[in-house]
Interface confidence: low
């Protein structure tokens, strides 16, 4: 007869490992007992369990509660055992010794491989600001056995660098994603993808990019200067900008205080019925935690009577 086993048994951390050992004998042969031991190189054999045809299963104290026979029905020639809740320390060489009658003893070895799936972590880099050079956006670390693969999935343009640290029974892989921050990256996902033979599917951790910036400011409302005449109601100036974090707006007048009746409402400056007092240089000041911008415009309130007088002069001059 002969023993049937596997060269390598692979399980994921925490799963049950079936250690196969089946005696394929001739008709009439019987298995008296099966002894399982751990036999790592350089260390003495450590008994796991003994399966006796008459007395049943005996588990050594070191493995008490962790070694069982497979559930019934059982073939009397099957000496396989289950190692419950495999841990990383279980990885190594195992041997089964089968005592048969009348053929004698047989032995076979297998290697137990315990996969330790990674628990990845993503750490965002320092605050991203538009205008910075190449900056760390995020780093992703995953430790497992064997070493996991760490990659990035994103539409954002950037560069990656990886490094690995080997430990006694595992390896930690860290990948960094660097980019040149721009406002278009705001809200874009940066996903760390971790692959490992112990995972049914890739693990993904998504970080949303947040880039501080402040756009140039501009003022709208003076497109048609002829509308800015004495008596006009509802005149307003609107300050245009965008930023992250969202900016705040402040209005001042360069050549004196804001005239009475002028209302400041965030990005908008509202005027009462226009008078010549409203002529002047107005400044919109936009700021956020990242930066500040100014935009100034000159308001020149026209007097229709003066204008009509000028037109008459021009006509008479021609």
């Amino acid at each position: 007869g002969e023993l049937e086993t596997s060269d390598v048994v692979t399980v994921v951390l925490g799963q049950d490992a079936k250690l196969p050992c089946f005696y394929r004998g001739d008709s009439g042969e019987q298995v008296g007992q099966v002894a399982w031991a751990r036999v790592d190189a350089g260390e003495g054999a450590q008994e796991l369990a003994l399966l006796h045809s008459k007395y049943g299963l005996h588990v050594s104290p070191a493995y008490e509660g962790r070694v069982e026979q497979p559930p019934p029905p059982r073939n009397p020639l099957d000496g396989s055992v289950l190692l419950r809740n495999a841990v990383q320390a279980d990885e190594g060489e195992y041997e089964c010794r089968v005592s048969t009658f009348p053929a004698g003893s047989f032995q076979a070895r297998l290697r137990l491989r315990v996969l330790v799936p990674p628990l990845p972590s993503l750490n965002p880099g320092p605050a991203l600001e538009e205008g910075q050079g190449l900056t760390l956006a995020a780093s992703c670390t995953a430790e497992g056995s064997p070493a996991p693969s760490v990659t990035w999935d994103t539409e954002v343009k950037g560069t990656t660098s990886s490094r690995s640290f080997k430990h006694s029974r595992s390896a930690a892989v860290t990948s960094e994603f660097h980019l040149v921050p721009s406002r278009s990256m705001n809200g874009q996902p940066l996903t760390c993808v971790v692959s490992h033979p112990g995972l049914l599917q890739d693990q993904r951790i998504t970080h949303i990019l947040h880039v501080s910036f402040l756009a140039e400011a501009s003022v709208r409302g003076l497109e048609d200067q002829n509308l800015w005449h004495i008596g006009r109601e509802g005149a307003m100036l609107k300050c245009l900008s965008e930023g992250q974090p969202p900016p705040s707006y402040n209005w001042t007048r360069l050549d004196g205080p804001l005239p009475s009746g002028v209302r400041v409402d965030g990005d908008t400056l509202g005027f009462p019925p226009l008078t010549t007092e409203h002529s002047g240089i107005y400044v919109c000041h936009v700021s956020n935690e990242f930066s500040s911008r100014d935009s100034q415009v000159t308001v020149d309130v026209l007097d229709p009577q003066e204008d009509s007088g000028k037109q008459v002069d021009l006509v008479s001059a021609s």
Epitope: Q188, P189, E242
Partner: antibody
């Protein structure tokens, strides 16, 4: 006026398919990220799927492989193709817009600031 | 996935009361936290974005605070129209997740 209007809901048997549509108006649709969020009867809100302005798509585990989100920027319309429907997919489905005052950046930071009125999907035999 | 836990699940209060609802994330989400109000038969409405920023058109009696894992929505003086269900939602990473909701009822 900024508006989202869902359609396409109805009664369907388990294993069947439906396609939801969401017509957007009043804003530059192509600049914004959009999501579908659902609410089962008497239950809380559950995010279903998102699509970025660039076309990247994301799904909740509960619908991955069964639902497909897409957009047609020329028609200002968001879609949700729902296949292999189950009883637990029964819900009101809302179309939502991500973004604050400017849709050109910071999709997630602002949360979902515009919601449709919802369309009801009932999966039952 | 990031889990969001709201407390309390329901709350009874009177008009004029100061009300606080809390939301806890299972991991740090910086300030990527939004609050919504939903009335029966209606779509949710965004109240607060980025943990503490008041959405345009929302009354100033609503305020938000917090960062990292712990967040708070406060209504300084409850009005009759504020009785509704309130949800928090993280926008730090996909899948986007909501709290289970807090139902605010009239005492």
């Amino acid at each position: 006026e900024v508006q989202l209007l869902e359609s396409g809901g109805g009664l369907v048997q388990p294993g069947g398919s439906l396609r939801l549509s969401c017509a957007a108006s009043g804003f530059t649709f192509s600049s914004y990220a959009m999501s579908w969020v659902r609410q089962a009867p008497g239950k809380g809100l559950e995010w279903v799927s998102a699509i970025y302005s660039g076309g990247s798509t994301y799904y909740a585990d509960s619908v991955k492989g069964r639902f497909t989100i897409s957009r047609d920027n020329s028609k200002n319309t968001l879609y949700l193709q729902m296949n292999s429907l189950r009883a637990e997919d029964t819900a009101v489905y809302y179309c939502t817009r991500h973004g604050g005052d400017s849709g050109s950046w910071s999709y997630y930071y602002y949360g979902m600031d515009v919601w449709g009125q919802g369309t009801t999907v009932t999966v039952s035999s | 996935d990031i889990q969001m836990t709201q407390s309390p699940s329901s709350l009874s209060a009177s008009v004029g009361d100061r009300v606080t609802i809390t939301c806890r994330a299972s991991q740090s989400i910086s300030s990527y936290l939004n609050w919504y109000q939903q009335k029966p038969g209606k779509a949710p409405k965004l109240l607060i974005y980025a943990a503490s920023s008041l959405q345009s058109g929302v009354p100033s009696r609503f305020s938000g605070s917090g960062s990292g894992t712990d967040f708070t929505l406060t209504i300084s003086s409850l009005q009759p129209e504020d009785f509704a269900t309130y949800y928090c939602q993280q926008s730090y990473s996909t899948p986007l997740t909501f709290g289970q909701g807090t139902r605010l009822e009239i005492k």
